[in-house]
Interface confidence: medium
């Protein structure tokens, strides 16, 4: 089995108030089985943002099918971005279990809120 | 090659300020985020600053955050570090440093310039 | 923010032993962990990426390893090039990126 590694290419984006961010993550692997999370900021005090398993995030969308089994992209857009989502995102692979158990995170995309275009 | 060369450091007073440029060469500056990276007499190295590639997202330590502003210039591919408010915990010898293309380590460094602090 | 302990502080060695020097998180940083050499009057130099990944142009005496938070680096055969400072930095959480505090190879 290939090792899994979890690719989060873009260090920072920037987005104006407003709009809708893209932040790709992509796996090079379909093992250990398990769903993937997003979270904002790292540690004990981060927020879930997306979770392959549950939901509704109302604003947050899949680019690529991710229900699909052989699906290896797992970018998310966040819409009607606001100041209060700047931060750092991270892209997270679980191991399933009982609880699901953190295996691999990508190394984080910082997120930049512009002021809205007068 | 590779290279970053830090102009600007001396001997100022506390209260004053000072500011640092780094000028770079070698490749495409502006596709790469950079760092300021101090060093106080005998101490570890501690991070201090960060600028990305186009300028828009900008970081600072805690212990520098309200006095120091890094800003870049890519028409001249120059890195710059303005200190106002010096203390004498600032002196330190100052590195510039380029970072990865893909993730948060430093692949170059300068030489350093080393900024005293003194009364 | 995360803290990393090094240890030991320094070490007193001869030219051909070999030694390991630890990289300690105060929480997990994954792979995202770097490995820097300092010398008196000389840029710091990358030596390991990833935890494991020599840079480029770095001897293959250098490795690393370690996943988490604990780290290793260690140097095969020291040569006298090698007697400097050592400091580990992860770039998982950040900012702030955070430093080692370092550890001194000396020569006996």
């Known amino acids: 089995e290939e090792e899994l590694q979890i690719i989060q290419p873009d260090k920072s984006v920037s987005v104006a108030a407003g709009e809708s961010a893209i932040l790709h993550c992509t796996i090079t692997s379909l093992f250990p089985v398990g769903p993937i999370q997003w979270f904002r900021g790292a540690g004990p005090a981060r927020v879930l943002i997306y979770n392959q398993r549950q939901g509704p995030f109302p604003r947050v969308t899949t680019v690529s099918e991710t229900t699909k089994r052989e699906n290896m992209d797992f970018s998310i857009s966040i819409s009607n971005i606001t100041p209060a989502d700047a931060g750092t995102y991270y892209c997270i692979k679980f191991r399933k279990g009982s609880p699901d158990t953190e295996f691999k995170s990508g190394a984080g995309t910082e997120l930049s809120v512009r002021a809205k275009p007068s | 090659d590779v290279q970053l060369v830090e102009s600007g450091g001396g001997v100022v007073r506390p209260g004053e300020s000072l500011r640092l440029s780094c000028a770079a060469s070698g490749f495409t500056f502006s596709s790469y985020d950079m760092n300021w990276v101090r060093q106080a007499p005998g101490e570890g190295l501690e991070w201090v600053s960060l600028?990305?590639?186009?300028?828009?997202?900008?970081y600072y330590a805690d212990s520098v955050k309200g006095r120091f502003t890094i800003s870049r210039d890519n028409s001249k591919n120059t890195l710059y570090l303005q200190m106002n408010s010096l203390r004498a915990e600032d002196t330190a010898v100052y590195y510039c440093?380029?970072?990865?293309?893909?993730?948060?380590?430093?692949?170059?460094w300068g030489l350093g310039a080393l900024v005293t602090v003194s009364s | 923010e995360t803290v990393l302990t090094q240890s030991p502080g320094t070490l007193t060695l001869s030219p051909g032993e070999r030694t390991t020097l630890t990289c300690r998180a105060s929480q997990s940083v994954y792979t995202y962990l770097a490995w820097y050499q300092e010398k008196p009057g000389q840029a710091p130099r990358l030596l390991i990426y990833g935890a494991s990944s020599r840079a480029t142009g770095i001897p293959d005496r250098f490795s690393g390893s370690g996943s988490g938070t604990e780290f290793t680096l260690t140097i095969s055969s020291l040569q006298s090039e090698d007697f400097a400072v050592y400091y580990c930095q992860q770039y998982y959480d950040r900012p702030p990126l955070t430093f080692g505090g370092g550890t001194k190879v000396e020569i006996k």
């Open positions: 440093a380029k970072e990865d293309n893909r993730y948060r380590f430093f692949d170059y």
């Open positions: 600028i990305s590639g186009s300028g828009e997202i900008i």
